[in-house]
């Protein structure tokens, strides 16, 4: 029976040109984590294998840094990076746990866009 739960950073925003840390945490299970995959839509960003360490996909090599921990750092953000990101925990014997993060990349500083979020 799968008893674990994934906590994520949830919905986050960052500035164009900046960087952001995507973080997930698996709790409430004693299952062994064998591998964590990070994905954006149908593109694999990175794999962190418990034995072998990190593999960064060739398409993201210059913009993705491993860590901290099992998290992932996205750098040089563009508006096209806006979207859903998934952390997939492969565990034994439980199976697979998936966490979702939504990232919004803003054109310029959050301060300048403050009005967008104000109630009229």
């Amino acid at each position: 029976m799968m008893t674990g739960t994934i906590e994520t950073t949830g919905n986050i925003s960052a500035e164009k040109g900046g960087s952001i840390i995507l973080q997930c945490h698996l709790s409430s299970t004693t299952a062994q984590v064998t591998q964590v995959n990070w994905e954006q839509q149908d593109q694999l960003l990175a794999i962190c294998n418990a034995d072998l360490g990190w593999h960064i996909s060739p398409s993201f090599k210059d913009r993705v840094a491993p860590g901290p921990g099992l998290g992932l750092t996205l750098q040089s953000l563009t508006v096209n990076d806006t979207g859903e990101y998934f952390c997939i925990y492969h565990t034994y014997p439980d199976g697979t746990y998936t966490g979702r993060i939504f990232l919004e990349v803003l054109e310029s500083s959050v301060a300048e866009h403050g009005a967008r979020f104000q109630i009229p």
Epitope: Q35, D42, I47, N49, D51, H55, S57, H90
Partner: antibody, heavy 119, light 107 residues
């Protein structure tokens, strides 16, 4: 260049253990990579059996978990496969291969060694 | 385990033709797929990783594409030396698994 070479007996009796050696030249097995065993059955089907990581951690295919052991001798730059309680179903060509985290695919392979299980 | 299915065991082609080999995963594997070529009497050789990236030294007539569950490996302008068995393999999750292979034969 990385080179891998399998060696071991070509004939094993049913219920006995199969033992193979992979000798690696041109790269230290403690530096990086996963050092894998893969077998190819008659009819061409390929099966990943398991690996030992550069740090010495083994990982096995669950279908073989109770019968397989992968170990290494770092002084000889070799890693080993032991498969116990073999049956005729274990007749195959056995390959050792390396997997690097740059590509996450088997980029160097040995030439393979044929093992027949028969009494 | 993830099952990788190559629906064609054999494909027949002529020198100079373009040929595409398909591979279907039983569940989502993102783009964590590699393709290998195995010539008669030889060990497999890595051609493509990350679904679409050619390995070092692989001629550009070999291409790969796909993500999710459906993958295609294409040889543009087949050469006589391309006669071989081609395998897909997923590395999305352990245990790593291979397709059953597609044998390319020259008409």
């Amino acid at each position: 260049d990385v080179q891998l070479q399998e060696s071991g007996p070509g004939l094993v009796k049913p219920s006995q253990s199969l033992s193979l050696t992979c000798t690696v030249t041109g790269y230290s097995i403690t530096s990086d990579y996963a050092w894998n065993w893969i077998r190819q059955f008659p009819g061409n089907r390929l099966e990943w059996m398991g690996y030992i990581s550069y740090s010495g951690a083994p990982r096995y295919n669950p279908s073989l978990k109770s019968r397989i052991s992968i170990t290494r001798d770092t002084s000889k730059n070799q890693f080993f496969l032991q498969l116990s309680f073999v049956t005729t179903e274990d007749t195959a060509t056995y390959y050792c291969a390396s997997l690097g985290t740059d590509y996450y695919a088997m980029d160097y392979w040995g030439q393979g060694t044929s093992v027949i299980v028969s009494s | 385990d993830i099952v990788m299915t190559q629906s064609h065991k054999f494909m027949f082609t002529s020198v100079g033709d373009r040929v595409s080999i398909t591979c279907k995963a039983s569940q989502h594997v993102s783009n964590a797929v590699a393709w290998y070529q195995q010539k008669p009497g030889q060990s497999p050789k890595l051609l493509i990783h990350s679904a679409s990236y050619r390995y070092t030294g692989v001629p550009d007539r070999f291409t790969g594409r796909g993500s999710g569950t459906d993958f295609t490996f294409t040889i543009n302008s087949v050469q006589a030396e391309d006669l071989a068995v081609y395998y897909c393999q997923q590395y999305y999750s352990l245990p790593w698994t291979f397709g059953g292979g597609t044998k390319l034969e020259i008409k």
